[in-house]
């Protein structure tokens, strides 16, 4: 029995619902009484949801899963996962047994956008050309881990003297703090870009230092 799932990972935003698609081709005369369907976590084999003896056996996974009962007879064995969280990320296997047997695995990639970075400067007053300043770029509640890039006002990448730390909160979402140490010129703009590699979402922050006063666009 051929079981079909998407080749590419299913990308789901944290907190939203995701559909893990799985389909099979029922033969003529097929009835749901013949169907055994099992969704399980590929790695641990933990049961997620099942259908057997003509009945939906329900969710075994935090009561956040559902089948599409009206579509099962047409060969749609897809699973709806509600309110996706970081811990759901991974591979799910769809097992279908009628008279024959088949299975396939689909990957769930969880994502959450990073907030617009906030910029802080230390020290933040009485600055002169030649002073060393620390610029911190902070962005919150994203997933997966971000890529952080710094550049100056001319678009030249700044790669030296950058320290980036990422810490997961209780929900598994990351807070990113990137610190740039730089020697001031006469004036200058320093920009931080926090990129979510899955969503291809870029969040920008910048600080312009013009002697006095400073501006935070």
């Amino acid at each position: 029995l051929e079981v079909q799932v998407p080749e590419d990972p299913v990308v789901a935003l944290v907190g939203t619902d995701a559909t893990l698609c799985c389909s099979f081709s029922p033969e003529p005369g097929f009835s749901l009484a013949q169907l055994n369907l099992i969704w399980q976590l590929t790695d641990t084999k933990q049961l997620v949801h099942s259908f057997a003896e003509g009945q939906d056996q329900g969710s075994a996974y935090a009561n956040r899963t559902a089948l599409f009962p009206d579509l099962l007879a047409q060969g749609n064995a897809s699973l709806r996962l509600q309110r996706v969280r970081v811990a759901d990320e991974g591979s799910f296997t769809c097992f279908v047994s009628i008279r024959d047997f088949g299975s396939a695995a689909v990957s769930l990639q969880v994502a959450a956008p990073y907030s617009k970075p906030s910029m802080t400067l230390e020290p933040n007053k009485d600055l002169r050309p030649g002073d060393t300043v620390t610029i911190t770029c902070s962005s919150y509640r994203g997933y997966p881990e971000a890529e952080v890039f710094w550049q100056d006002g001319q678009g030249v990448p700044l790669t030296g003297n950058v320290t980036t730390s990422q810490m997961a909160n209780e929900q598994g979402l990351f807070d990113v703090h990137s610190v740039l140490r730089v020697v001031l010129g006469a004036n200058g703009t320093y920009s931080c870009l926090v990129r979510n590699p899955v969503l291809q979402q870029d969040a920008h922050g910048s600080v312009t230092i013009t002697g006095q006063p400073m501006t935070f666009p």
Epitope: V14, G15, T16, S115, E170
Partner: antibody, heavy 120, light 108 residues
């Protein structure tokens, strides 16, 4: 049942200060983002400030209040605060305390609000 | 800052009729959009989050749709208690969290 009860509103003059409190019950207060949202008379909703749950307690502010307002929380007392300094006439509004969802930043429970009037 | 524009500002509808109103975002907010209902003298109440998911206790006559920049809240058959102001809110690009200006649903 989740309950949020604001207090501390009143009438003040421009330039004065006020501290709002929000007593929370019915949920694990320390785990959740909490926010203040205000509504000027006859106007729409305006987000003011947010403090995140968990150990980080990151704070965020609307540009209109940055540098004047400070959000804080006391998890041992299940209480959210908003310290408002250098108050202006345009800060006159009903201030609502709102509980964030665990996963995203929308507000699933709101208090009844407390009125702040800034007038000379 | 993402600006949310709600239309119409006021909607006059008779009880039992269908009401549809719009929230348009100045930038893509994916599905990170919520809807609230507010009655005079009361706090807002969450209706819909993540564009389509009804909050606990919200009747199924309320439904949300859309993605990206264009979103819709539909009340399939207006009940007397549905006459209120409805606000949308985005939580994709923050701070700041932003609300739409509101749509007032009044009795025709």
């Amino acid at each position: 049942d989740v309950q949020l009860v604001e207090s501390g509103g009143g009438v003040v003059r421009p330039g004065e200060s006020l501290r709002l409190s929000c007593a929370a019950s019915g949920f694990t207060f320390s785990s959740y983002d909490m926010s203040w949202v205000r509504q000027a008379p006859g106007e729409g909703l305006e987000w003011v400030s947010l403090i995140s749950g968990g150990i980080s307690a990151n704070t965020h502010y609307a540009d209109s209040v940055k540098g004047r307002f400070t959000i804080s929380r006391d998890n041992s007392k299940n209480t959210l605060y908003l310290q408002m300094n250098s108050l202006r006439a345009e800060d006159t509004a009903v201030y609502y305390c709102a509980k964030g969802d665990l996963w995203n930043i929308f507000f699933d429970y709101w208090g009844l609000g407390t009125l702040v009037t800034v007038s000379s | 800052e993402i600006v949310l524009t709600q239309s119409p500002a006021t909607l006059s509808v008779s009880p039992g009729e269908r009401a549809t109103f719009s929230c348009r975002a100045s930038q893509n907010v994916r599905s990170y959009l919520a809807w609230y209902q507010q009655k005079p003298g009361q706090a807002p109440r969450l209706l819909i989050f993540n564009t389509v998911t009804r909050a606990t206790g919200i009747p199924d006559r309320f439904s949300g749709s859309g993605s990206g920049t264009d979103f819709t809240l539909t009340i399939s058959s207006l009940e007397p208690e549905d006459f209120a102001v409805y606000y949308c809110q985005q939580y994709y690009d923050w701070p700041p969290l932003t609300f739409g200006g509101g749509t007032k649903v009044e009795i025709k």
